[in-house]
């Protein structure tokens, strides 16, 4: 069995550079002169005049002394008497603190001082001498120990490759116990004979006693550079490897300790880990229950799979993400939990290892630990949620999750905020159970304060608006979603981030926003009155030129300005107009701006759901018969008549309607003839009655899954803005964290056409539109 | 330097039986492994059963069953009872005692001639 001493080195494994240095003092039983643990080495002084060190004088304590000392009256003969007892014992009370060794046993010698448990004068007076001996007699020790192992390394050496078995174990221990001092020690790691009979012992015998002592050994050593060089170059990684697989205990301690020093302090040691196949090993050593031989297991795992793909494949192989999320859930050691959602956080950017995370219960078992005192538990989980949380968005059971993320909206620390915001925006994407759970724990109330609280960080208030984005449209709570936004307050703030210092990313998110608070009509004299108008056509305007400008140029390829297409934000800015152009103030204010030339140009784009939202808006402002003048004026005719051709039934249905609208004022024959285009334009494929085919609405479902932001995605971004310092254990820099991001053109639905008026009898039950082509509203970019 | 003499050597039959004794002289510390090996004509010399200061007894796979080694602390001295001779347990047989000290000390026997033929 191992000592309690050899067992109590594990948890020195954890930080082996400074805990090693001082456990071997103590195992040595070295005296403590209060030099190491600070041990304070003064007394009150019987003087009264207390410590002349000390500024504080406790006086309370020193007259309780004398109020014992002295509380008998003494004779003078007494008095006489015990002058001459000390006069007669001075030199053995010196000799007794100086040198308490050459005292004869059972000697009594009268104290001067009354209390025991303080020193005398002299005692203290002898402390620096007591110190310098006690230096000199270590010294002596170390080159002792030293010489004798210099003097027996070769014969025990000979001795552990002896063919006796019985030999062989008793040399192993003998080196084991050599290996436990200091001086010794070093001498076995300057042997490199030593050290490989050491590991070859270790992984031949068939002996458990001599199998701890070996691996006993080995972990003694590693706690040097020196030792664990020798350890490497003496094939040590592959024979430890062999060890994770002994069913001793013990064993097994002394084997992972010592990979772990390896790992974190020895170059070419993970790749030695890697090909001798501890990878595997170490995952099926996950099903142990002792905390802190787990802790150290899954730290090797994460210094192993950092940075390493094909290290993140065979655990996944090995069956690695189910077991650390058992961890995850079984567990509430921090040290181990903390290790365990390390390993997670790196194998989340990998993406075969996030699926397998999210279907072992990962989002649920991280979640158990959101609400944790350990900050870096927290601030760990939280990052590997939204690496994850682009791959959950079909999880069920997420309800706890969800609560929690938006109680983290709450928190002062900016990091928690930002990760809690990405996560709630991947989480609400295209799922209506979790954005119906999100509204009714608070959310939307939780958002909008964040965003207001965020001012200009954009790592928080671009997630925050995409959260808010897709909970206000396409589930049952989405109307209450759209009034909650301005009844708390958010309305200016929204409109407020379509301006500077706001990037490409948060104007395109923030503009899908507006788009969908646009269709509470509550919100739309709110949005006028905030200036929401003129800005989104500036945003129009200014975009379309960028596309202009590069078509002229003869550039074919759509650009990217900070991750975002210019094309998707004059189709977001038009779709938002469009919303709002079904109040009949807002129409004016947009009519105002000489919008009608820019919308009838954007019929002439190649782009299918820009002509959708192109053709939208003017169809509202057809309403009004000036702009329905205004709009013909234009030249719209001709596209309009072209697009009731289109393949995609949302632009020809739009077209139609305001090509219907533009009639208006026409003579009847006009009308007939235009008629009879929209019937064989419209029902070109399938002809039916008027009145048999449904509503309107045009409700096209989302596009697609969300994507991670990878590095190879055109639109990948970064959730950090900066690098984060490295963990205790390992190194970690920020590389590893960049990954699954939110997904900012998440979760767009396409909302019914307007309601066309005195035209309805005409438009009732067009086809419904189809499903397909909705780039920007639907999928996550 | 502690002495070992060996005895109890000679010529038998193949399936017949011999007792090797061994005495040390000289003190002997404690934590210590008496033991025999031997060394057939031209081969290397092999490990035959060790027996330490406690008891605990350790055979090679090619006599277990058929020999038993034994010790006597006070008289500091060990026999290899060997039964079921066979002709390749010919050579000579070294009496060697390990005392675990450190340094260790190794004290070899000069050897006793063991003939195992028909």
């Known amino acids: 069995m191992a000592t309690q001493a050899d067992l109590m080195e594990l948890d020195m494994a954890m930080e082996p550079d400074r805990k090693a240095a001082v456990s071997h003092w103590q195992q040595q039983s070295y005296l403590d002169s209060g030099i190491h643990s600070g041990a304070t080495t003064t007394a009150p002084s019987l003087s009264g005049k207390g410590n002349p060190e000390e500024e504080d004088v406790d006086t309370s304590q020193v007259l309780y002394e004398w109020e014992q000392g002295f509380s008998q009256s003494f004779t003078q003969e007494q008095v006489a008497d015990i002058d001459g007892q000390y006069a007669m014992t001075r030199a053995q009370r010196v000799r007794a603190a100086m040198f308490p060794e050459t005292l004869d046993e059972g000697m009594q010698i009268p104290s001067t001082q009354f209390d025991a448990a303080h020193p005398t004068n002299v005692q203290r007076l002898a402390e620096p001498s007591q110190m310098l001996k006690h230096a000199v007699v270590n010294l002596i020790n170390y080159q002792d120990d030293a010489e004798l192992a210099t003097r027996a390394i070769p014969e025990l050496t000979k001795l552990l490759n002896d063919e006796d078995q019985v030999v062989v174990n008793k040399a192993a221990v003998m080196v084991h116990q050599l290996s436990k001092k200091e001086a010794s020690r070093h001498a076995i790691m300057r042997s490199p004979q030593m050290v490989s009979a050491i590991v070859r012992t270790m992984q031949n015998t068939n002996d458990v006693e001599t199998a701890r002592c070996t691996a006993g050994t080995l972990h003694n050593l590693s706690h040097h550079r020196e030792g664990l060089l020798a350890i490497f170059k003496s094939g040590g990684i592959p024979a430890l490897v062999k060890m994770l697989g002994s069913p001793v205990d013990s064993v097994l301690f002394y084997a992972i300790t010592t990979l772990h020093n390896l790992l974190l302090h020895q170059e070419g040691a993970k790749m030695a880990v890697r090909l001798a196949g501890g990878l595997q090993k170490m995952v099926a050593l996950l099903n142990k229950t002792n905390v802190k031989f787990l802790a150290i297991t899954t730290d090797c795992l994460q210094i192993l799979a950092y940075g390493n793909q094909e290290s993140k494949l065979i655990i996944l192989a090995s069956g690695g993400p189910q077991a650390l999320v058992n961890i995850m859930r079984t567990y509430t050691y921090e040290k181990l939990l903390w290790t365990t959602s390390r390993v997670l956080k790196v194998l989340s950017v990998c993406s075969s290892n996030k699926p397998a995370i999210v279907e072992a219960g990962g989002m649920q078992a991280l979640g158990l630990h959101l609400t944790d005192p350990s900050q870096r538990l927290v601030q760990n989980c939280l990052w590997t949620l939204r690496n994850l949380s682009d791959a959950a968005t079909k999880q069920e059971g997420m309800e706890g999750l969800l609560g929690t993320l938006v109680q983290l909206l709450g928190s002062d620390d900016i990091n928690v905020v930002t990760c809690a915001a990405g996560i709630l925006s991947n989480l609400t994407c295209n799922n209506y159970k979790n954005k119906m759970m999100v509204c009714q724990v608070g959310g939307i109330e939780a958002l909008v304060r964040t965003v207001l609280r965020a001012g200009d960080r954009e790592d928080i208030t671009e997630p925050a608006i995409c959260a808010l984005r897709h909970l206000t449209s396409r589930h049952q709570e989405a109307e209450m979603a759209q009034n909650a936004v301005r009844l708390h307050y958010g309305l200016p703030v929204v409109v407020k981030l379509l301006h500077p210092p706001s990037h490409w990313p948060l104007i395109k998110a923030t503009v899908g926003l507006i788009r969908n608070l646009a269709l509470c009509p509550a919100n739309h004299a709110p949005l006028r009155e905030q200036g929401a108008i003129p800005r989104l056509v500036q945003l129009l305007v200014r975009a379309h030129q960028d596309t202009q400008r590069r078509t002229s140029m003869g550039g074919t390829q759509q650009q990217f300005v900070e991750g975002v297409r210019m094309e998707e934000i004059v189709e977001g800015c038009t779709g938002a107009l469009h919303i709002l152009a079904r109040d009949v103030h807002n129409r004016i204010v947009i009519r105002g701006l000489n919008t009608i030339p820019l919308f009838v140009q954007l019929l002439y784009s190649p782009i299918e759901n820009i002509q959708r939202v192109a053709a939208g808006v003017l169809c509202e402002l057809a309403q009004d018969k000036e702009a329905a003048e205004a709009i013909e004026a234009e030249g719209a005719t001709a596209p309009l008549t072209e697009l009731l051709h289109s393949r995609n039934e949302g632009v020809a249905t739009y077209a139609a309607a305001v090509l219907f609208r533009m009639s208006e004022d026409k003579p009847q024959d006009y009308k007939k003839r235009l008629s009879v285009e929209l019937t064989s334009s419209l029902f070109r494929t399938e002809p039916m009655a008027w009145n048999e085919t449904a509503d309107l609405g045009l409700d096209i479902g989302a596009q697609g899954e969300p994507l991670g932001y990878r590095q190879d995605d055109p639109s990948y971004r970064s959730f950090h803005s900066g690098g984060y310092g490295q963990d205790a254990l390992g190194m970690d820099p920020m590389m590893e964290h960049e990954m699954g991001g939110h997904h900012p053109g998440a979760d767009y639905p396409v909302d019914g056409l307007p309601d066309l008026g005195h035209a309805q009898d005409l438009m009732d039950g067009l086809p419904p539109g189809d499903s397909n082509q909705l780039a920007w509203f639907d999928t996550d970019l | 330097q502690v002495q070992l003499v060996e005895s109890g050597g000679g010529l038998v039959q193949p399936g017949g039986s011999l007792r090797l004794s061994c005495a040390a002289s000289?003190?002997?510390?404690?934590?210590?492994?008496m033991g025999w090996y031997r060394q057939g004509p031209g081969k290397q010399r092999e490990f035959v059963a060790s027996?330490?200061?406690?008891?605990?007894?350790n055979y090679a796979a090619s006599v277990k069953g058929r020999f038993t080694i034994s010790r006597d602390n006070a008289k500091n001295t060990v026999n290899l009872q060997m039964n079921s001779l066979r002709p390749e347990d010919t050579g000579v047989y070294y009496c060697r005692l390990t005392i675990m000290t450190y340094p260790p000390t190794i004290s070899w026997g000069q050897g006793t001639q063991v003939t195992v033929s028909s």
């Open positions: 000289g003190t002997i510390s404690s934590n210590n492994v």
């Open positions: 027996v330490t200061d406690s008891d605990l007894a």
